[in-house]
Amino acid sequence: SGTTNTVAAYNLTWKSTNFKTILEWEPKPVNQVYTVQISTKSGDWKSKCFYTTDTECDLTDEIVKDVKQTYLARVFSYPAGNVESTGSAGEPLYENSPEFTPYLETNLGQPTIQSFEQVGTKVNVTVEDERTLVRRNNTFLSLRDVFGKDLIYTLYYWKSSSSGKKTAKTNTNEFLIDVDKGENYCFSVQAVIPSRTVNRKSTDSPVECMGQEKGEFREI
């Protein structure tokens, strides 16, 4: 099956973070090139990354059209310099990807603490609302726009002098927590989509501590 020098792609893998979505596969081509096709379950195939020697293809533009759809991709192998050549069945060799539903499966990117402000014994911590490549009415949507209340943030906060991490949760991008007067605290946030069964958590944000430039302190 296939022409003498052509091998089918294998290990097709979706790599997706905050909807930036790339299909990767093996092997590195030797005397062959690849073309990728993508479709929804009910849709037509659309070709991307024509006759490439890469082993990845950015499919973001296609999946952001409807992130709740389930997508399937396939990678075709052609002999280099003879892309009209087909396999023994009259078709070029191809391999199917696993199905991919961006809304359920895209990894949550590392969040960033935008700011924190202390007023007396309260601290307001704000998480940056990261922009995605999902568009609506010609504007890019934020992570919160896309996921709405499905997305929560978990805040870990602790006294600089201790190791135990307290937690708070929000389905906005802001936390208001109680702190002890005169104590310095450190903060880290994690994005979570509790309704998922996989890829529920992001990596933790960089740790930010009071007394550093991101914060603001006001004694009341």
Epitope: I152, T154, K165, T167, T170, Q190, P194, S195, T197, K201
Partner: antibody
């Protein structure tokens, strides 16, 4: 099917140590949080502490701080409670529970418990 | 830490009775309150989450409500399998805390 199974309980002398295990199946612990809760004989529920196995972050109740340590081995899908300097008042059934992690739901699945008796 | 004061500590009731258990939080906990049922020798089971939502598989005779920092668990018509101990719990702040429990016994 989600399951949590505790083990490692038993009789130990005051000042001794014990390590409890909480083996999870039906879900991946690094996607959730694991809590330990204990119940002294004939008494109510007392929260002991939690771990986020994804990053190793923990918090322990004041009553066990410095004596108990919660850890996790994600490759074994198991959480642990290391108990040192045990006292008679630590005698209890120890439960591990899964934290669903939403604003609304916290401890949705519990293990069957393991009895720790501290006595000379 | 937030205290959850549960009352009564025990009550006697008959099958078919309407039973009400209350829990008062020492400060605002929003709706981050759960109710658990525990039978002797068994682990607690989640009944109500977010103050008033029935957990999956729990009979509809159980309900929860909130009024400020007061939380109520109601069993509309007590069944034989409902004789157990009930606990409230807040998870609004760390550490989460439980009420002292209410034992529902057969009259």
């Amino acid at each position: 099917e989600v399951q949590l199974v505790e083990s490692g309980g038993g009789l130990v002398q005051p000042g001794g140590s014990l390590r409890l295990s909480c083996a999870a199946s039906g879900f991946t612990i690094s996607d959730y949080w694991i809590h330990w809760v204990r119940q002294a004989p004939g008494k109510g529920l007392e929260w002991v502490g939690f771990i986020d196995p994804y990053n190793g972050y923990t918090y322990h109740a004041d009553s066990v701080e410095g004596r108990f340590t919660i850890s996790a081995d994600t490759s074994k899908n198991t959480a642990y409670l290391q108990m040192n300097s045990l006292r008679a008042e630590d005698t209890a059934v120890y439960y591990c529970a899964r934290d669903y992690g939403s604003l609304q739901v916290q401890l949705d699945y519990w293990g069957q418990g393991t009895l720790v008796t501290v006595s000379s | 830490d937030i205290q959850m004061t549960q009352s009564p500590s025990s009550l006697s009731a008959s099958v078919g009775d309407r039973v009400t258990i209350t829990c008062r939080a020492s400060q605002d906990v929003n709706t981050a309150v759960a109710w658990y049922q525990q039978k002797p020798g068994k682990a607690p089971k989640l009944l109500i989450y977010s103050a008033s939502f029935l957990y999956s598989g729990v009979p509809s005779r159980f309900s929860g409500s909130r009024s400020g920092t007061d939380f109520t668990l109601t069993i509309s018509s007590l069944q034989p399998e409902d004789f157990a101990t009930y606990y409230c719990q807040q998870h609004y702040t760390t550490p989460p805390t439980f009420g002292q429990g209410t034992k529902v016994e057969i009259k």
